[in-house]
């Protein structure tokens, strides 16, 4: 605790500081999302969103942030994703976002308002001052896990999984040694917060890294482990090999092609 106190005084943490223009970026993204990207959320007051966001971490010790701190923001940014349209991902962020860029009715967490606001940003404050720390922020490994960014993603990931319904898809990276990683946000948070009374199936898409690879990666031991976890929660599990991620890239370039519209 004394180490945290000293570090907070000199504000020298092991991670990079708050993203430049952080307040402006949040407001700009909020306006873009609510007015252009998803006009059905135009009722959202972006100034209120920023105030709630700010309130979650400003003047608070950046290693003592709780999920409770983000509840006012979650309440303001509450959003319903239609059943069968939730796409989770683990180590496939770029591919998952390319997919939802084309398949506009499908949502990753970063396609929801709160995820969109915070995507790729860093932020933290300083204990007992109203300043935003642009010099450094706590690193999850080097400093502490209860930092503003980590707690935010854990909180919104939990909520995103809890609100999912119908068939939920997850895009996994077949090139990784552990295709399903229990330590990832998907493995540690989302999997355990899918609601069996609302979600009847989790379908994993295992992305191969190119044509010519004919292995059945759905047989991977880590996938079998995922199947066991999901089945124990009374959710049906299924898994599909996706051999053609190259098609993502083609479709990202020409999304108007009818070959880029597929049902899931």
């Amino acid at each position: 605790v004394s180490r945290w106190h000293q570090q907070s005084q000199r504000s020298q943490w092991g991670g990079r500081g708050t993203t430049d223009r952080f307040p402006e970026i949040i407001l700009e993204r909020c306006v873009e999302y609510t007015q252009t990207l998803l006009p059905e959320m135009r009722h959202v007051d972006c100034q209120n969103i920023w105030d709630a966001f700010k309130g979650a971490f400003i003047s608070k010790h950046p290693c003592k942030i709780t999920e409770e701190d983000y509840q006012p923001l979650l309440k303001l940014g509450n959003q319903t994703v239609p059943c069968n349209k939730t796409l989770l991902w683990s180590r496939t962020k770029h591919l998952a976002h390319q997919y939802t860029e084309i398949q506009r009715d499908v949502f990753t967490l970063e396609d929801t308002l709160l995820g969109y606001l915070a995507d790729d940003l860093t932020w933290c404050g300083e204990f007992e001052t109203s300043e935003i720390n642009y010099r450094s922020c706590p690193d999850w490994r080097k400093d502490c896990s209860s930092n503003p960014v980590s707690v935010f993603w854990k909180t919104v990931s939990r909520r995103f999984a809890e609100s999912a319904c119908g068939v939920v898809h997850v895009m996994l990276n077949g090139s990784c040694s552990n295709i399903f990683d229990k330590k990832s946000t998907f493995g540690s948070v989302e999997v355990h917060n899918l609601q069996p009374e609302k979600v009847h199936t989790l379908e994993a898409w295992v992305m191969h890294d190119g044509r010519g690879d004919s292995r059945d990666l759905c047989q991977d031991p880590s996938i079998k482990e995922l199947e066991l976890i999901i089945s124990k929660r009374n959710i049906t599990f299924s898994c599909k090999n996706i051999y053609r991620p190259d098609k993502f890239l083609q479709c990202a370039k020409t999304p108007e092609d009818s070959s880029c519209i597929s049902k899931i």
């Epitope: 044509r211 004919s214 996706i242 051999y243 190259d246 083609q250 092609d257 009818s258 070959s259 597929s262």
Partner: antibody, heavy 121, light 106 residues
Framework: QVQLVESGGGLVQPGGSLRLSCAAS????????MNWVRQAPGKGLEWVSG????????YYADSVKGRFTISRDNSKNTLYLQMNSLRAEDTAVYYC??????????????WGQGTLVTVSS | DIELTQPPSVSVAPGQTARISCSGD??????VSWYQQKPGQAPVLVIY???NRPSGIPERFSGSNSGNTATLTISGTQAEDEADYYC????????FGGGTKLTVLG
């Protein structure tokens, strides 16, 4: 509407060559991967070869690798299959098929009527 | 490569349900499509991505896929459904089943 019309089939002796063409219309040809699928008389379907939308990647069944060459001319909306060192077992109706299915799955939504290739002495 | 096995023939009375199986090792791990082919004609896609019907295909055609078997189901089979049916999947290369001749009796 989508149309695929094959031509170039015929009778050829073993060891001979033949070039099949497939004229495409009714869609943006350069946006789609294309394939050749064949069907021997009274038999099932067999995938032969495929080519990416811009022609940069080509794929072949083991049975034709090194003998057949797939190519395309997007300016002419035409797909080709150059068949060399033909064998009796290459006798079949050859279909040109458009590869559909986006990023998650692969299938053939549109087929031509086929052109018959007979390899016999 | 995955091998897809279909029964050579299936018979069904008009109005009854026809089920055509396509078996393969863990075929449920792959998306399966189905084609209908009538004599002298090109194949026609009737099901893609396990269970999706292209526009223009009657609702009586449906598909499922899990475990080691994919199934094409034709409910209320009609005389015009008499044809050869092929399942197809992809695992780095396109693979077709051997085909099933569907006979509508009577």
């Amino acid at each position: 509407q989508v149309q695929l019309v094959e031509s170039g089939g015929g009778l050829v002796q073993p060891g001979g060559s033949l070039r099949l063409s497939c004229a495409a219309s009714g869609f943006t040809f350069s946006s789609y991967a294309m394939n050749w699928v064949r069907q021997a008389p009274g038999k099932g379907l067999e995938w032969v070869s495929g080519i990416s939308s811009w022609g940069s990647s080509t794929y072949y069944a083991d049975s034709v690798k090194g003998r057949f060459t797939i190519s395309r001319d997007n300016s002419k909306n035409t797909l080709y299959l150059q068949m060399n060192s033909l064998r009796a077992e290459d006798t079949a109706v050859y279909y040109c098929a458009r590869e559909d299915g986006s990023y998650m799955t692969d299938y053939f939504a549109y087929w031509g009527q086929g052109t018959l290739v007979t390899v016999s002495s | 490569d995955i091998e897809l096995t279909q029964p050579p023939s299936v018979s069904v009375a008009p109005g009854q349900t026809a089920r055509i199986s396509c078996s393969g090792d863990n075929i449920g791990h792959y998306y399966v499509s189905w084609y209908q082919q009538k004599p002298g004609q090109a194949p026609v896609l009737v099901i893609y991505s396990d269970s999706n019907r292209p526009s223009g295909i009657p609702e009586r055609f449906s598909g499922s896929n899990s475990g080691n078997t994919a199934t094409l189901t034709i409910s209320g089979t009609q005389a015009e459904d008499e044809a050869d049916y092929y399942c197809q999947s992809y695992n780095g290369t396109y693979v077709f089943g051997g085909g099933t001749k569907l006979t509508v009796l009577g």
